[in-house]
Protein backbone atom coordinates (compact mmCIF):
# COMPACT_ATOMS: atom_id res chain seq x y z
CA UNK A 1 0.00 0.00 0.00
CA UNK A 2 1.00 3.67 -0.18
CA UNK A 3 2.19 3.68 3.41
CA UNK A 4 4.81 0.93 2.96
CA UNK A 5 7.80 3.13 3.51
CA UNK A 6 6.50 5.79 5.82
CA UNK A 7 8.14 5.93 9.23
CA UNK A 8 6.38 6.83 12.44
CA UNK A 9 7.66 9.89 14.27
CA UNK A 10 9.58 9.24 17.48
CA UNK A 11 11.25 11.15 20.33
CA UNK A 12 8.31 13.54 20.54
CA UNK A 13 9.44 16.26 22.94
CA UNK A 14 7.84 19.43 24.26
CA UNK A 15 10.14 22.48 24.30
CA UNK A 16 8.48 25.27 26.22
CA UNK A 17 9.77 28.48 27.81
CA UNK A 18 7.47 31.13 29.25
CA UNK A 19 4.64 29.34 27.38
CA UNK A 20 6.29 29.63 23.94
CA UNK A 21 5.74 25.96 23.13
CA UNK A 22 7.13 23.86 20.32
CA UNK A 23 6.72 20.15 19.75
CA UNK A 24 9.82 18.50 18.27
CA UNK A 25 10.27 15.02 16.88
CA UNK A 26 12.40 12.80 14.67
CA UNK A 27 13.26 11.66 12.00
CA UNK A 28 13.99 14.11 9.20
CA UNK A 29 11.46 13.03 6.55
CA UNK A 30 12.30 11.13 3.40
CA UNK A 31 9.39 10.71 0.97
CA UNK A 32 6.96 11.64 3.72
CA UNK A 33 5.44 14.66 5.42
CA UNK A 34 3.93 15.29 8.83
CA UNK A 35 0.76 16.80 10.20
CA UNK A 36 0.42 17.49 13.92
CA UNK A 37 -2.78 17.30 15.92
CA UNK A 38 -3.30 18.70 19.41
CA UNK A 39 -6.09 18.12 21.91
CA UNK A 40 -7.04 18.58 25.50
CA UNK A 41 -8.22 15.46 27.30
CA UNK A 42 -11.84 16.28 26.55
CA UNK A 43 -11.49 18.27 23.31
CA UNK A 44 -11.30 17.75 19.57
CA UNK A 45 -8.11 16.82 17.77
CA UNK A 46 -7.09 19.97 15.90
CA UNK A 47 -4.71 19.68 12.96
CA UNK A 48 -1.78 22.08 12.83
CA UNK A 49 1.44 22.32 10.77
CA UNK A 50 -0.15 20.65 7.77
CA UNK A 51 1.88 18.41 5.44
CA UNK A 52 5.19 19.75 6.72
CA UNK A 53 8.73 18.55 6.16
CA UNK A 54 9.77 20.29 9.38
CA UNK A 55 10.35 18.24 12.51
CA UNK A 56 8.88 20.82 14.83
CA UNK A 57 5.54 22.54 15.22
CA UNK A 58 4.80 25.70 17.14
CA UNK A 59 1.73 24.96 19.27
CA UNK A 60 1.88 28.13 21.35
CA UNK A 61 -1.39 29.51 19.95
CA UNK A 62 -3.21 26.40 21.13
CA UNK A 63 -1.77 25.96 24.62
CA UNK A 64 -2.12 29.62 25.62
CA UNK A 65 -5.90 29.30 25.34
CA UNK A 66 -5.81 27.59 28.74
CA UNK A 67 -2.38 27.09 30.26
CA UNK A 68 -3.77 24.98 33.12
CA UNK A 69 -5.20 22.34 30.78
CA UNK A 70 -3.32 19.16 29.98
CA UNK A 71 -2.53 18.72 26.28
CA UNK A 72 -1.67 15.76 24.13
CA UNK A 73 -0.28 15.98 20.62
CA UNK A 74 0.20 13.39 17.92
CA UNK A 75 2.30 13.47 14.80
CA UNK A 76 0.98 11.78 11.65
CA UNK A 77 3.34 10.51 8.96
CA UNK A 78 1.95 10.73 5.44
CA UNK A 79 3.58 9.26 2.32
CA UNK A 80 4.73 11.92 -0.12
CA UNK A 81 6.91 10.81 -2.94
CA UNK A 82 7.95 7.86 -4.98
CA UNK A 83 6.88 5.12 -2.63
CA UNK A 84 7.34 1.49 -3.56
CA UNK A 85 3.78 1.00 -4.67
CA UNK A 86 0.77 3.20 -5.20
CA UNK A 87 -2.66 2.21 -4.09
CA UNK A 88 -5.24 3.09 -1.49
CA UNK A 89 -3.45 3.62 1.78
CA UNK A 90 -4.74 2.48 5.14
CA UNK A 91 -4.73 4.59 8.26
CA UNK A 92 -1.64 6.78 8.45
CA UNK A 93 0.97 6.10 11.08
CA UNK A 94 1.06 8.38 14.10
CA UNK A 95 2.84 8.70 17.39
CA UNK A 96 1.56 10.31 20.60
CA UNK A 97 3.47 12.89 22.58
CA UNK A 98 3.81 12.82 26.35
CA UNK A 99 1.10 14.81 28.11
CA UNK A 100 1.96 18.46 28.70
CA UNK A 101 0.50 20.90 31.21
CA UNK A 102 1.93 24.33 30.43
CA UNK A 103 1.30 25.90 33.83
CA UNK A 104 3.16 23.11 35.57
CA UNK A 105 5.84 22.39 33.00
CA UNK A 106 6.83 25.38 30.88
CA UNK A 107 10.41 26.37 31.62
CA UNK A 108 10.90 29.68 33.33
CA UNK A 109 12.91 31.91 31.02
CA UNK A 110 16.09 33.59 32.16
CA UNK A 111 15.02 36.69 34.09
CA UNK A 112 16.50 40.14 33.61
CA UNK A 113 17.32 42.72 36.23
CA UNK A 114 15.51 45.82 35.06
CA UNK A 115 17.09 48.30 37.46
CA UNK A 116 18.55 48.84 40.89
CA UNK A 117 18.59 51.97 42.97
CA UNK A 118 20.56 52.67 46.11
CA UNK A 119 19.26 55.04 48.72
CA UNK A 120 21.70 55.16 51.59
CA UNK A 121 22.15 51.63 52.92
CA UNK A 122 19.15 50.26 51.06
CA UNK A 123 19.08 48.97 47.50
CA UNK A 124 15.88 48.40 45.55
CA UNK A 125 16.35 45.75 42.84
CA UNK A 126 13.59 45.40 40.23
CA UNK A 127 13.14 42.31 38.03
CA UNK A 128 11.69 42.81 34.55
CA UNK A 129 8.18 41.36 34.39
CA UNK A 130 8.53 39.46 31.16
CA UNK A 131 5.65 39.41 28.70
CA UNK A 132 4.30 35.98 27.76
CA UNK A 133 2.21 34.93 24.78
CA UNK A 134 -0.76 34.21 27.04
CA UNK A 135 -3.60 36.59 26.24
CA UNK A 136 -6.54 37.94 28.15
CA UNK A 137 -8.92 40.51 26.69
CA UNK A 138 -6.61 40.90 23.70
CA UNK A 139 -3.59 41.90 25.77
CA UNK A 140 -0.52 39.80 26.50
CA UNK A 141 -0.08 38.82 30.12
CA UNK A 142 3.19 39.07 32.01
CA UNK A 143 4.75 36.14 33.83
CA UNK A 144 3.52 37.62 37.11
CA UNK A 145 -0.02 38.00 35.69
CA UNK A 146 -0.07 34.31 34.84
CA UNK A 147 1.60 32.81 37.91
CA UNK A 148 0.63 35.33 40.57
CA UNK A 149 2.04 34.43 43.98
CA UNK A 150 3.08 30.97 42.72
CA UNK A 151 6.11 32.73 41.24
CA UNK A 152 8.89 34.01 43.46
CA UNK A 153 12.28 35.47 42.67
CA UNK A 154 15.48 34.71 44.51
CA UNK A 155 18.13 37.43 44.56
CA UNK A 156 21.78 36.53 44.94
CA UNK A 157 23.97 39.46 45.89
CA UNK A 158 27.56 39.93 46.97
CA UNK A 159 30.15 42.58 47.49
CA UNK A 160 32.24 43.15 44.39
CA UNK A 161 35.28 42.71 46.56
CA UNK A 162 34.31 39.29 47.95
CA UNK A 163 32.76 35.99 46.91
CA UNK A 164 30.36 35.41 49.83
CA UNK A 165 26.81 35.41 48.47
CA UNK A 166 23.67 36.44 50.31
CA UNK A 167 20.11 35.65 49.19
CA UNK A 168 16.74 37.33 49.41
CA UNK A 169 13.32 36.24 48.20
CA UNK A 170 10.23 38.09 47.01
CA UNK A 171 6.81 37.17 45.66
CA UNK A 172 6.66 40.49 43.82
CA UNK A 173 9.19 41.71 41.28
CA UNK A 174 11.07 43.93 43.71
CA UNK A 175 13.66 43.42 46.44
CA UNK A 176 14.67 45.89 49.13
CA UNK A 177 17.95 44.83 50.71
CA UNK A 178 20.41 46.24 53.20
CA UNK A 179 23.92 46.97 52.01
CA UNK A 180 27.07 48.33 53.56
CA UNK A 181 27.70 51.96 52.85
CA UNK A 182 30.49 52.63 50.41
CA UNK A 183 30.53 49.07 49.03
CA UNK A 184 29.69 48.07 45.47
CA UNK A 185 27.47 44.99 45.06
CA UNK A 186 26.68 42.60 42.25
CA UNK A 187 23.27 41.02 41.69
CA UNK A 188 21.74 38.03 39.97
CA UNK A 189 18.15 36.79 40.14
CA UNK A 190 16.42 33.49 39.54
CA UNK A 191 12.72 32.79 38.96
CA UNK A 192 11.31 29.96 41.08
CA UNK A 193 7.95 28.23 41.40
CA UNK A 194 8.31 26.42 44.75
CA UNK A 195 5.13 24.36 44.34
CA UNK A 196 6.43 22.61 41.22
CA UNK A 197 8.01 19.19 41.11
CA UNK A 198 9.76 19.76 37.74
CA UNK A 199 11.25 22.84 36.08
CA UNK A 200 11.15 24.67 39.39
CA UNK A 201 13.89 27.18 38.66
CA UNK A 202 15.05 29.34 35.79
CA UNK A 203 18.65 29.87 34.91
CA UNK A 204 20.26 32.81 36.69
CA UNK A 205 19.93 36.25 35.17
CA UNK A 206 23.01 38.00 33.81
CA UNK A 207 25.00 39.59 36.65
CA UNK A 208 24.56 43.32 37.15
CA UNK A 209 26.93 45.30 39.36
CA UNK A 210 26.71 48.68 41.04
CA UNK A 211 28.75 51.35 39.36
CA UNK A 212 27.41 50.26 35.96
CA UNK A 213 24.77 51.97 33.84
CA UNK A 214 21.70 50.01 35.02
CA UNK A 215 21.75 51.33 38.56
CA UNK A 216 21.31 54.64 40.21
CA UNK A 217 23.20 55.72 43.30
CA UNK A 218 21.87 58.35 45.64
CA UNK A 219 23.65 59.27 48.87
CA UNK A 220 21.16 60.47 51.45
Amino acid sequence: SGTTNTVAAYNLTWKSTNFKTILEWEPKPVNQVYTVQISTKSGDWKSKCFYTTDTECDLTDEIVKDVKQTYLARVFSYPAGNVESTGSAGEPLYENSPEFTPYLETNLGQPTIQSFEQVGTKVNVTVEDERTLVRRNNTFLSLRDVFGKDLIYTLYYWKSSSSGKKTAKTNTNEFLIDVDKGENYCFSVQAVIPSRTVNRKSTDSPVECMGQEKGEFREI
Partner: antibody, heavy 117, light 106 residues
Framework: EVQLVQSGAEVKKPGESLKISCKGS????????MNWVKQMPGKGLEWMGM????????RLNQKFKDKATLSVDKSISTAYLQWSSLKASDTAMYYC??????????WGQGTTVTVSS | DIQLTQSPSSLSASVGDRVTITCSAS?????MNWYQQKPGKSPKIWIY???NLASGVPSRFSGSGSGTDFTLTISSLQPEDFATYYC?????????FGGGTKVEIK
Protein backbone atom coordinates in the same frame (compact mmCIF):
# COMPACT_ATOMS: atom_id res chain seq x y z
CA GLU B 1 -22.30 8.56 6.01
CA VAL B 2 -20.37 11.84 5.74
CA GLN B 3 -22.30 14.50 3.84
CA LEU B 4 -21.79 18.18 3.08
CA VAL B 5 -24.96 19.85 1.83
CA GLN B 6 -24.72 23.38 0.48
CA SER B 7 -27.42 26.01 0.15
CA GLY B 8 -29.13 26.71 -3.15
CA ALA B 9 -28.18 28.94 -6.07
CA GLU B 10 -28.25 32.71 -5.55
CA VAL B 11 -28.75 35.61 -7.94
CA LYS B 12 -27.70 38.98 -6.56
CA LYS B 13 -26.99 42.54 -7.65
CA PRO B 14 -23.59 44.21 -7.22
CA GLY B 15 -23.22 45.77 -3.76
CA GLU B 16 -25.63 43.36 -2.10
CA SER B 17 -24.64 41.07 0.74
CA LEU B 18 -24.85 37.28 0.77
CA LYS B 19 -24.26 34.35 3.07
CA ILE B 20 -24.12 30.80 1.71
CA SER B 21 -23.99 27.69 3.89
CA CYS B 22 -22.54 24.21 4.09
CA LYS B 23 -24.10 21.76 6.54
CA GLY B 24 -22.01 18.79 7.69
CA SER B 25 -23.46 15.53 8.90
CA UNK B 26 -22.33 11.99 9.61
CA UNK B 27 -19.16 13.05 11.44
CA UNK B 28 -17.90 15.22 14.30
CA UNK B 29 -18.32 18.61 12.64
CA UNK B 30 -16.07 20.48 15.09
CA UNK B 31 -13.10 18.14 14.58
CA UNK B 32 -12.30 18.91 10.94
CA UNK B 33 -11.16 22.04 9.16
CA MET B 34 -13.57 23.15 6.44
CA ASN B 35 -12.20 24.48 3.14
CA TRP B 36 -13.89 26.81 0.69
CA VAL B 37 -12.98 26.66 -3.00
CA LYS B 38 -14.04 29.08 -5.75
CA GLN B 39 -14.54 28.15 -9.41
CA MET B 40 -15.43 30.90 -11.85
CA PRO B 41 -17.44 29.87 -14.94
CA GLY B 42 -15.26 27.80 -17.27
CA LYS B 43 -12.22 28.38 -15.08
CA GLY B 44 -10.05 26.53 -12.59
CA LEU B 45 -10.20 25.99 -8.83
CA GLU B 46 -9.09 28.58 -6.29
CA TRP B 47 -8.53 27.86 -2.59
CA MET B 48 -10.17 30.65 -0.59
CA GLY B 49 -9.36 29.49 2.91
CA MET B 50 -10.50 27.24 5.70
CA UNK B 51 -12.01 27.41 9.17
CA UNK B 52 -11.78 25.17 12.21
CA UNK B 53 -15.31 24.89 13.64
CA UNK B 54 -14.36 24.17 17.27
CA UNK B 55 -12.74 27.58 17.80
CA UNK B 56 -13.36 29.43 14.49
CA UNK B 57 -9.66 29.81 13.70
CA UNK B 58 -9.34 30.71 10.02
CA ARG B 59 -6.59 30.41 7.43
CA LEU B 60 -7.51 32.76 4.63
CA ASN B 61 -5.97 33.21 1.23
CA GLN B 62 -4.88 36.87 1.37
CA LYS B 63 -6.46 37.39 -2.03
CA PHE B 64 -9.88 37.01 -0.35
CA LYS B 65 -9.00 38.76 2.93
CA ASP B 66 -11.15 41.85 2.40
CA LYS B 67 -13.70 40.20 0.16
CA ALA B 68 -15.16 37.22 1.99
CA THR B 69 -15.65 36.06 5.57
CA LEU B 70 -15.71 32.51 6.90
CA SER B 71 -17.79 31.60 9.95
CA VAL B 72 -19.50 28.63 11.59
CA ASP B 73 -22.45 27.80 13.77
CA LYS B 74 -21.39 24.72 15.75
CA SER B 75 -24.87 24.20 17.15
CA ILE B 76 -26.23 23.34 13.71
CA SER B 77 -22.97 21.95 12.21
CA THR B 78 -22.90 24.59 9.51
CA ALA B 79 -20.11 26.58 7.91
CA TYR B 80 -20.74 29.88 6.14
CA LEU B 81 -19.12 31.98 3.45
CA GLN B 82 -20.32 35.54 3.28
CA TRP B 83 -19.84 38.80 1.38
CA SER B 84 -20.84 42.26 2.54
CA SER B 85 -20.71 43.83 -0.92
CA LEU B 86 -20.78 41.56 -3.95
CA LYS B 87 -19.01 42.29 -7.23
CA ALA B 88 -19.47 40.78 -10.68
CA SER B 89 -16.14 38.98 -10.17
CA ASP B 90 -17.75 37.03 -7.31
CA THR B 91 -19.87 35.18 -9.87
CA ALA B 92 -18.74 31.57 -9.45
CA MET B 93 -19.46 28.12 -8.11
CA TYR B 94 -18.41 27.81 -4.46
CA TYR B 95 -17.57 24.46 -2.88
CA CYS B 96 -17.04 23.54 0.72
CA UNK B 97 -14.74 20.57 1.33
CA UNK B 98 -13.74 18.85 4.54
CA UNK B 99 -9.98 18.87 5.09
CA UNK B 100 -8.94 15.26 5.01
CA UNK B 101 -5.88 13.19 4.46
CA UNK B 102 -5.58 10.77 1.59
CA UNK B 103 -8.57 9.03 0.07
CA UNK B 104 -11.04 10.61 2.45
CA UNK B 105 -12.50 13.32 0.28
CA UNK B 106 -15.79 15.02 1.02
CA TRP B 107 -17.05 17.96 -1.01
CA GLY B 108 -20.37 19.76 -1.04
CA GLN B 109 -22.37 19.80 -4.28
CA GLY B 110 -21.50 23.47 -4.80
CA THR B 111 -23.46 26.71 -4.64
CA THR B 112 -23.78 28.86 -7.77
CA VAL B 113 -23.59 32.60 -7.09
CA THR B 114 -24.48 34.97 -9.91
CA VAL B 115 -23.86 38.69 -9.47
CA SER B 116 -25.40 40.79 -12.20
CA SER B 117 -27.09 44.16 -12.48
CA ASP C 1 2.33 32.25 -3.07
CA ILE C 2 3.39 29.12 -4.93
CA GLN C 3 2.21 29.23 -8.54
CA LEU C 4 1.37 25.95 -10.24
CA THR C 5 1.52 25.82 -14.02
CA GLN C 6 -0.11 22.85 -15.72
CA SER C 7 0.65 21.77 -19.24
CA PRO C 8 -0.90 21.26 -21.57
CA SER C 9 -4.03 23.25 -20.71
CA SER C 10 -5.97 20.85 -22.90
CA LEU C 11 -5.22 17.78 -24.97
CA SER C 12 -7.06 15.52 -27.38
CA ALA C 13 -6.29 11.83 -27.16
CA SER C 14 -7.74 8.51 -28.19
CA VAL C 15 -8.80 5.57 -26.06
CA GLY C 16 -5.68 3.47 -25.35
CA ASP C 17 -3.26 6.39 -25.60
CA ARG C 18 -0.66 7.12 -22.96
CA VAL C 19 -1.29 10.59 -21.54
CA THR C 20 1.07 12.70 -19.44
CA ILE C 21 0.09 15.91 -17.64
CA THR C 22 2.74 18.03 -15.93
CA CYS C 23 2.52 20.49 -13.07
CA SER C 24 5.38 22.89 -12.53
CA ALA C 25 5.67 24.79 -9.23
CA SER C 26 7.27 28.22 -8.78
CA UNK C 27 9.09 26.92 -5.70
CA UNK C 28 9.73 23.55 -4.12
CA UNK C 29 6.70 21.54 -3.04
CA UNK C 30 6.68 18.50 -0.76
CA UNK C 31 2.99 17.59 -0.88
CA MET C 32 1.05 17.51 -4.13
CA ASN C 33 -2.46 16.25 -4.85
CA TRP C 34 -4.28 15.71 -8.13
CA TYR C 35 -8.06 16.08 -8.58
CA GLN C 36 -10.39 14.90 -11.33
CA GLN C 37 -13.45 16.99 -12.20
CA LYS C 38 -16.18 16.15 -14.64
CA PRO C 39 -18.63 18.78 -16.01
CA GLY C 40 -21.26 19.81 -13.48
CA LYS C 41 -19.66 17.76 -10.70
CA SER C 42 -17.56 18.50 -7.64
CA PRO C 43 -13.84 17.69 -7.88
CA LYS C 44 -12.64 14.31 -6.58
CA ILE C 45 -9.28 13.50 -5.04
CA TRP C 46 -7.43 11.34 -7.55
CA ILE C 47 -3.82 11.16 -6.40
CA TYR C 48 -2.55 12.35 -3.02
CA UNK C 49 0.92 12.80 -1.60
CA UNK C 50 2.49 12.95 -5.08
CA UNK C 51 2.06 9.28 -5.96
CA ASN C 52 -0.68 7.60 -3.93
CA LEU C 53 -3.86 6.62 -5.71
CA ALA C 54 -7.10 7.54 -3.98
CA SER C 55 -9.56 4.77 -3.21
CA GLY C 56 -11.20 3.39 -6.36
CA VAL C 57 -8.76 5.05 -8.77
CA PRO C 58 -7.64 2.56 -11.45
CA SER C 59 -4.00 1.45 -11.51
CA ARG C 60 -3.51 2.88 -15.01
CA PHE C 61 -3.09 6.23 -13.23
CA SER C 62 0.20 7.11 -11.61
CA GLY C 63 1.78 10.18 -10.09
CA SER C 64 5.42 11.10 -9.69
CA GLY C 65 7.78 14.00 -9.21
CA SER C 66 9.61 15.99 -6.59
CA GLY C 67 10.75 19.53 -5.95
CA THR C 68 9.10 21.68 -8.60
CA ASP C 69 8.11 19.17 -11.28
CA PHE C 70 5.24 16.71 -10.98
CA THR C 71 3.47 14.40 -13.39
CA LEU C 72 0.16 12.58 -13.66
CA THR C 73 0.28 9.73 -16.18
CA ILE C 74 -2.52 7.61 -17.63
CA SER C 75 -0.94 4.54 -19.17
CA SER C 76 -3.92 3.62 -21.36
CA LEU C 77 -6.68 6.18 -21.64
CA GLN C 78 -10.22 4.91 -21.08
CA PRO C 79 -13.56 6.58 -21.96
CA GLU C 80 -14.30 7.37 -18.31
CA ASP C 81 -10.98 9.25 -17.96
CA PHE C 82 -12.12 12.18 -20.11
CA ALA C 83 -12.28 15.02 -17.58
CA THR C 84 -10.31 17.99 -16.27
CA TYR C 85 -7.37 17.30 -13.93
CA TYR C 86 -6.01 19.79 -11.41
CA CYS C 87 -2.84 19.67 -9.35
CA UNK C 88 -2.87 21.23 -5.88
CA UNK C 89 0.02 21.95 -3.52
CA UNK C 90 -0.43 21.76 0.23
CA UNK C 91 3.15 22.58 1.21
CA UNK C 92 2.62 26.21 2.08
CA UNK C 93 -0.26 28.61 2.61
CA UNK C 94 -2.14 29.70 0.67
CA UNK C 95 -2.77 26.30 -0.84
CA UNK C 96 -2.95 26.68 -4.61
CA PHE C 97 -4.28 24.81 -7.63
CA GLY C 98 -2.91 24.56 -11.12
CA GLY C 99 -4.99 25.97 -13.96
CA GLY C 100 -6.24 22.53 -15.00
CA THR C 101 -5.74 20.20 -17.95
CA LYS C 102 -8.80 19.21 -19.97
CA VAL C 103 -8.50 15.73 -21.49
CA GLU C 104 -10.81 15.47 -24.50
CA ILE C 105 -11.68 12.72 -26.95
CA LYS C 106 -9.88 12.95 -30.29
Amino acid sequence: EVQLVQSGAEVKKPGESLKISCKGSGYSFTSYWMNWVKQMPGKGLEWMGMIYPADSETRLNQKFKDKATLSVDKSISTAYLQWSSLKASDTAMYYCAREDYGSSDYWGQGTTVTVSS
Amino acid sequence: DIQLTQSPSSLSASVGDRVTITCSASSSVSYMNWYQQKPGKSPKIWIYGISNLASGVPSRFSGSGSGTDFTLTISSLQPEDFATYYCQQKSSFPWTFGGGTKVEIK
